[in-house]
């Protein structure tokens, strides 16, 4: 039994880091493998992660952490019984994938303005809370070409757009994702999408 693709890990910079790897053949990850991880910190103890299958030869493990600070570094040991298959380390602050925003809501009752709001996925005491920026994706269910991205580079989790920038009388969907420039993170997953019917009063044309 050998590791074909070494574990790569990403952290949500809060409480979970996810590690993925591939074996050289079909593997029952949960019965055959264990991933031991330990914070490089005086008196800390090792923890064991039981991996799950992620495709035939793929494995994934969700490492639970108390919290994360930038200096944290973990040792990782991948075991198959008594055999050490791989040894490595992981610094969560250097491999951050933020949590996805939640509670995306479209408020359509503001005169001809669409107000999209969502929740910051981090508590106020987490470093990323004040460092997230967002991308909002809006698309038409009727017209695949009607697809747009709005970059929200301010901290407030909201976006205002004129309803007239979208077509009237048809349904739209929106979703939002986050990233943090300070840690050069990857983008989060998209939030669940929300749907609304876009309608607004056409301006009266004078001839």
């Amino acid at each position: 039994m050998k590791v074909l693709q070494e574990p790569t890990c990403v952290s949500d910079y809060m409480s979970i880091s996810t590690c993925e790897w591939k074996m050289n053949g079909p593997t029952n990850c949960s019965t055959e493998l264990r991933l031991l991880y330990q914070l490089v910190f005086l008196l800390s103890e090792a923890h064991t992660c039981i991996p799950e299958n992620n495709g035939g030869a793929g494995c994934v493990c969700h490492l639970l952490m108390d919290d994360v600070v930038s200096a944290d570094n973990y040792t990782l040991d991948l075991w198959a019984g008594q055999q050490l298959l791989w040894k490595g380390s992981f610094k969560p602050s250097e491999h951050v994938k933020p949590r996805a925003p939640g509670n995306l809501t479209v408020h359509t009752n503001v005169s001809d303005t669409l107000l999209l709001t969502w929740s910051n996925p981090y508590p106020p005491d987490n470093y990323l809370y004040n460092h997230l920026t967002y991308a909002v994706n809006i698309w038409s269910e009727n017209d695949p070409a009607d697809f747009r991205i709005y970059n929200v580079t301010y901290l407030e989790p909201s976006l205002r757009i004129a309803a007239s920038t979208l077509k009237s009388g048809i349904s739209y969907r929106a979703r939002v994702r986050a990233w943090a420039q300070c840690y050069n993170t990857t983008w989060s997953e998209w939030s669940p999408s929300t749907k609304w019917h876009n309608s607004y009063r056409e301006p009266f044309e004078q001839h």
């Epitope: 914070l39 910190f41 600070v69 200096a71």
Partner: nanobody, 115 residues
Framework: QVQLVESGGGLVQPGGSLRLSCAAS?????MAWFRQAPGKEREAVAT????????YYADSVKGRFTISRDNSKNTLYLQMNSLKAEDTAVYYC???????????WGQGTLVTVSS
């Protein structure tokens, strides 16, 4: 220059309690309490990470000692309950920029547990 000033040591009866304090000039990733008993090597007793959420203990003090830090005052504490004669030692505060926790040391404070 980093300064660590411990206080709170003294003589206490078995089963008693003491609270040690350590004033630090600066904020550090790792803050720790070590102790050295007569004729023995210095050993780590308890450690705490920046932010103060994660704490770690030597098996010999688990359930009896509590480490904490007040980040606003840059002060480290060690609450010692149910003290035993074998807890008698000089207690040292130490801080570090990494998880080894041994970059800077205090001068030590003596704790004597005796009836």
């Amino acid at each position: 220059q980093v300064q660590l000033v411990e206080s709170g040591g003294g003589l206490v009866q078995p089963g008693g309690s003491l609270r040690l304090s350590c004033a630090a000039s600066g904020d550090f990733y790792c803050m720790a309490w070590f102790r050295q008993a007569p004729g023995k090597e210095r050993e780590a007793v308890a450690t705490i990470r920046s932010g103060g959420r994660s704490t770690y203990y030597a098996d010999s003090v688990k359930g009896r000692f509590t480490i904490s830090r007040d980040n606003s005052k840059n002060t480290l504490y060690l609450q010692m309950n149910s003290l035993k004669a074998e807890d008698t030692a000089v207690y040292y505060c130490a801080v570090g920029v990494d998880g080894n926790c041994r970059n800077y040391w205090g001068q030590g404070t003596l704790v004597t547990v005796s009836s």
